[in-house]
Interface confidence: low
């Protein structure tokens, strides 16, 4: 490690022999301390301009002792002004002052770059009293210095409402270059230019930059930090880093991967979440994005049926969420489904195709020839109908739903009955006399309830009077 100490002018003689507790680092000299019997004179030499009188930060005490002897001005002694050392070394420096014993309770504080150093710092103050003066040595030590310890350190002492300030001690911690900006990973278009930036600082300065691509240096001559590397374009992935050099040595940045944007990988894990008669809800897991954000996806649907024309339905959707409800499908049909997604470069291949089926639908036609008449002897309404002509996709008939609405004197009540698929007639109890009963019938499959037939009305008279006028729904072609 390079360690430099520039000792300033020392116009005062040393204490005879070393003082306890005044250990020095290997780059500082023993500080100038006063004789135990003398005062420090007011005239001092400037640390920056030796030989010139220095009347800087001194306190001129006005208090006199019992014998009315005027006290001389007080000032910190000069010490080493500039310490240069390597990172992680230990350093100790101090300031000293001789104070007449008439001053009680003097304390010394350490300041760095204008801020007082409080708390867990290694500051020790030692007092060496004599008959008339006390020599005070304030030591400050730093273990394993960091760059953050760089700065200007001073001592301050308050006496008689006067503040005495020492000359600054400049600590300069030198080390390997420290990156303030490193290259960043990027995803770039093939054969398109892009820039990478690298910046590092000392001390010591200057810091020179070399660029490295896939373990080979890019520039023969170093560039002064900061450096911008313009890469004219890449055809394949590359790893870039930069080397920062100063007098202390070399620091290498993180290696960053520059990826070439490509078409995405096909989506995977296409899954069926829910099927209805006319829709299928699917999800998928996107493939690798090809280093470029997905823009949208395409859901491709083919009907798997020997009689279908093999045409593909295409549904475009956003890339996220990775779900899509395919609508407008045939009931009870088999489909093959694939998903493809695109980024700025292009479309992925289609995912592995999966098979999915829609469920059976509800019937699309109502029962035919609905007739309704009153069976007075049983006090019920007899209803008859014909089975509707349903398509295969509607699935297997499981029964019928009968709606009968009773209206009398402003009161209306709807009731529903379910009957099995083998029935083509039903009887319902009369609910209200002197009322109109309106009947509608719908076919039911596992896919749901079909449309209701047109309403058929019958009047239910008061007891003892019967109207046998039935209504009906004619079958198609029988009108």
């Amino acid at each position: 490690a390079i360690t430099e100490a520039r000792e300033e002018a020392k116009p005062y003689p040393l204490f005879p022999g070393p003082l306890p507790g005044s250990l020095q680092t290997d780059h500082t000299s023993l500080l100038s301390l006063p004789h135990t019997s003398g005062y420090q004179p007011a005239l001092m030499f400037s640390p920056t301009q030796p030989g010139r009188p220095y009347t800087g930060n001194v306190a001129i005490p006005r208090v006199t002792s019992a014998g009315s002897k005027l006290l001389p001005p007080l000032a910190f002694k000069h010490t080493v002004g500039h310490i240069i050392l390597s990172e992680h070394k230990d350093v100790k420096f101090n300031c000293s002052i001789s104070v007449p014993n008439i001053y009680q309770d003097t304390t010394i504080s350490w300041w760095k770059d204008g801020k007082e150093l409080l708390g867990a710092h290694h500051a020790i103050t030692q007092f060496y009293p004599d008959d008339e003066v006390t020599a005070i040595i304030a030591s400050f030590s730093i273990t394993s210095v960091q760059r953050s310890d760089n700065g200007s350190y001073i001592c301050k002492m308050k006496i008689n409402n006067e503040e005495i300030v020492s000359d600054p001690i400049y600590i300069e911690v030198q080390g390997l270059p420290h990156f303030t900006k490193q290259p960043e990973s990027m995803n770039v278009t093939r054969n398109t230019a892009f820039n990478l930036t690298c910046q590092a600082v000392g001390p010591p300065e200057p810091v020179n930059i070399f660029w490295v691509q896939n373990s080979s240096r890019v520039n023969e001559q170093p560039e002064k930090s900061p450096s911008v590397l313009t890469v004219p374009g890449l055809t394949e992935m590359a790893v870039f880093s930069c080397e920062a050099h100063n007098d202390k040595g070399l620091t290498v940045s993180k290696g960053v991967q520059i990826n070439i944007k490509a078409i995405p990988s096909p989506p995977t894990e296409v899954s069926i979440h829910n099927s209805t008669a006319h829709s299928i809800l699917i999800s998928w897991v996107p493939g690798f994005d090809g280093y470029s954000p997905f823009r949208n996806c395409s859901v491709q649907v083919k009907e798997v049926d020997p009689l279908s024309n093999g045409s593909v339905m295409i549904f475009n959707t956003s890339a996220s969420p990775h779900m899509y409800q395919i609508k407008q499908l045939q009931a009870l049909a088999n489909y093959s489904i694939g998903v493809s997604c695109m980024n700025e470069i292009g479309w992925s291949a289609v995912s592995p195709w999966i098979l999915a089926s829609t469920t059976e639908g509800a019937p699309s036609v109502a029962p035919l020839n609905v007739t309704v008449f009153l069976n007075e002897s049983r006090d019920n309404v007899d209803i008859r109908w014909m089975k509707p002509l349903t398509k295969r996709q509607a699935g297997e008939l499981v029964g019928y739903r009968i709606s009968h609405v009773w209206q009398s004197a402003g009161i209306s009540k709807e009731l529903l009955e379910e009957v099995g698929q083998n029935n083509s007639r039903a009887q319902i109890s009369v609910q209200v006399h002197n009322a109109t009963c309106t009947v509608r019938i719908a076919a039911v499959t596992k896919g749901g309830v079909g449309p209701f037939s047109d309403p058929v009305k019958i009047f239910i008279p008061a007891h003892g009077w019967v109207d046998h006028a039935p209504s009906s729904t004619p079958a198609p072609g029988n009108a």
Epitope: E269, S271, V285, F288, D289, Y291, P293
Partner: antibody, heavy 119, light 106 residues
């Protein structure tokens, strides 16, 4: 190398909101993938909470749907979890992770942050 | 949601012994992913898409299965394999994890 770091308060009072931050280095959260929150309850059960995708879309666990919000700050490369109306049942270690891509699952995880819900 | 049931919940194995952990799904899933977790650390991706080993995973590990039944196998148990292993599915939202199998060394 991709790194994720969770941060946030370790103690939250019941009925308050839990807010956590996940700071991502080594990969831009807009560059791809799905940026996910997972939690692990004291009995070690893991629960996928939801994600925010690279383009800002969300997907949440239905069990949390009304309480959870995942947002992001692309300028800071961070994404956030907000869980409202917490109860002691929300006491867990919360992890953020990157999900999707070639491996199609959570390939990078944060080290986790422990959150206790207690009055 | 799809429930993943792992068995056994806890098991011990001697060094060199073959170990199999199973994961059953309440509905069919397309792939299973596996994570390893050691105390005080976050889960690590161990096996992805049923049978692919994540980076740095020893070759003594393997994964297999389809539909609702999946397994993770260690051909010869080693001390460093002692950990909790979780299965995970991403075939259906919400993504779910198994309850974990704690594998101890005898």
């Amino acid at each position: 190398d991709v790194q994720l770091q969770e941060s946030g308060p370790g103690l939250v009072k019941p009925s308050q909101s839990l807010s956590l931050t996940c700071s991502v280095t080594g990969y831009s959260i807009t560059g791809g993938y799905y940026w996910t929150w997972i939690r692990q309850f004291p009995g070690n059960k893991l629960e996928w909470m939801g994600y925010i995708s690279y383009d800002g879309d969300n997907n949440y666990n239905p069990s949390l749907k009304n309480r959870i919000s995942i947002t992001r700050d692309t300028s800071k490369n961070q994404f956030f979890l907000n869980l409202n109306s917490v109860t002691t049942e929300d006491t867990a270690t919360y992890y953020c992770a990157r999900e999707g891509g070639r491996l199609r699952t959570m390939d990078y995880w944060g080290q986790g942050t422990s959150v206790t819900v207690s009055s | 949601q799809i429930v993943l049931t792992q068995s056994p919940a806890i098991m011990s194995a001697s060094p060199g012994e073959k170990v199999t952990i199973t994961c059953r799904a309440s509905s069919s899933v397309n792939y299973m992913h596996w994570f390893q977790q050691k105390p005080g650390t976050s889960p690590k991706l161990w096996i992805y898409t049923t049978s692919n080993l994540a980076s740095g995973v020893p070759a003594r590990f393997s994964g297999s299965g389809s539909g609702t039944s999946y397994s993770l196998t260690i051909s010869r148990m080693e001390a460093e394999d002692a950990a909790t292993y979780y299965c995970q599915q991403r075939s259906s939202y919400p993504f779910t994890f198994g309850s974990g199998t704690k594998l101890e060394i005898k």
